[in-house]
Amino acid sequence: QKSSIEKCSVDIQQSRNKTTERPGLLNCPIYWQQLREKCLLFSHTVNPWNNSLADCSTKESSLLLIRDKDELIHTQNLIRDKAILFWIGLNFSLSEKNWKWINGSFLNSNDLEIRGDAKENSCISISQTSVYSEYCSTEIRWICQKELTPVRNKVYPDS
């Protein structure tokens, strides 16, 4: 039995996968910040996790996915105020009793040191210094990401 948050995450991810693949993104759009091969957008407003997920989707992006501790640190370095929390694309899957990224992969326990409980309706936020489990209904800011994928590295069939 999937929770409503899990369903929302799966629905949005599936709809993103159905869309026609666009040409690679060479530069970050206005107001987005480049971090290595990604463009990040830090919201100014606050929303619950599922609204944040939906907002990133409308921007043809996703909530932030963090590959490893190194990427976490570099992302945290972009956060100017240590008191501010941002949603990322990680929430607790009740059916699988594990932290699950919105791309369907599970959290490697070594990647993030999460403060707080792993339980139903828990979603992950990051601050300048830490990673927290919060109720998904909490209204905080969020980070969207777009992958920078240079066109010259893309291989399209029938081209």
Partner: antibody
């Protein structure tokens, strides 16, 4: 170049509903937020409300009970409805692009709405 | 009553510098680095001049600069030119997804 164009009646009777539409061209409509702002003659600016193209909205607390902002993404349009208007609602109404939720980088030219019987 | 307080007027001669202040509280200006400034000529729509306290959109001359200290933000126009004569409004994020404006300052180039 991003362009915004407000449209709607210039005269509304007291106690009725003010309705305006903003048409956006020249940009990815769904990638931004969109706001309504008003300015009474000779006075300052007042933020009315914001629309996320995902469908959620935020409103100025002082107007929240009377305001609805909605979207038609297929037409690249968003709308304002302000009910139970009085003469104090007479103003130039602007629509604006609201990139991150705290500032407005492109504005419509504004439309004057007068509330009078 | 505007949420943010600006002086009603400011003036300077061509070539001089003028600073316009915008005072709020710890719930708006002091609490967030999300202050913006707008220029409005008579009968025209406002134009964004500064956002996030000190960032300038492309096309805005570098004569315009923004800063913040505590609960007060400032817009400085250096090397004043005749076309800078306009009304200037500050704005700030105010928490709970709300945005507030100042009452405006009329800048006169003498």
């Amino acid at each position: 170049q991003v362009q915004l164009q407000e449209s709607g009646p210039g005269l509304v009777k007291p106690s009725e509903t003010l309705s305006l539409t903003c048409t956006v061209s020249g940009d990815s409509f769904s990638s931004y937020y969109w706001s309504w702002i008003r300015q009474p003659a000779g006075k300052g600016l007042e933020w009315i409300g914001r629309l996320y193209t995902s469908g959620s909205t935020n409103y100025n607390p002082s107007l929240k009970s009377r305001v609805t902002v909605s979207v038609d993404t297929s037409k690249n349009q968003f709308s304002l409805k302000l009910n139970s208007v009085t003469a104090a609602d007479t103003a130039v109404y602007y629509c604006a692009r609201d990139p991150l939720g705290s500032f407005f980088d492109y504005w419509g030219q504004g439309t004057l709405v007068t509330v009078s019987s | 009553q505007s949420a943010l307080t600006q002086p009603p007027s400011a003036s300077g001669s061509p070539g001089q510098s003028v600073t316009i202040s915008c005072t709020g509280t710890s719930s708006d200006v002091g609490g967030y680095n999300y202050v913006s400034w707008y220029q409005q000529h008579p009968g025209k729509a406002p134009k964004l001049m500064i956002y996030e306290v000190s960032k300038r959109p492309s096309g805005v001359p570098d004569r315009f600069s923004g800063s913040k200290s505590g609960n007060t933000a400032s817009l400085t126009v250096s090397g004043l030119q005749a076309e800078d004569e306009a009304d200037y409004y500050c704005s700030s994020y105010a928490g709970s997804n709300n945005v507030v404006f100042g009452g405006g300052t009329k800048l006169t180039v003498l």
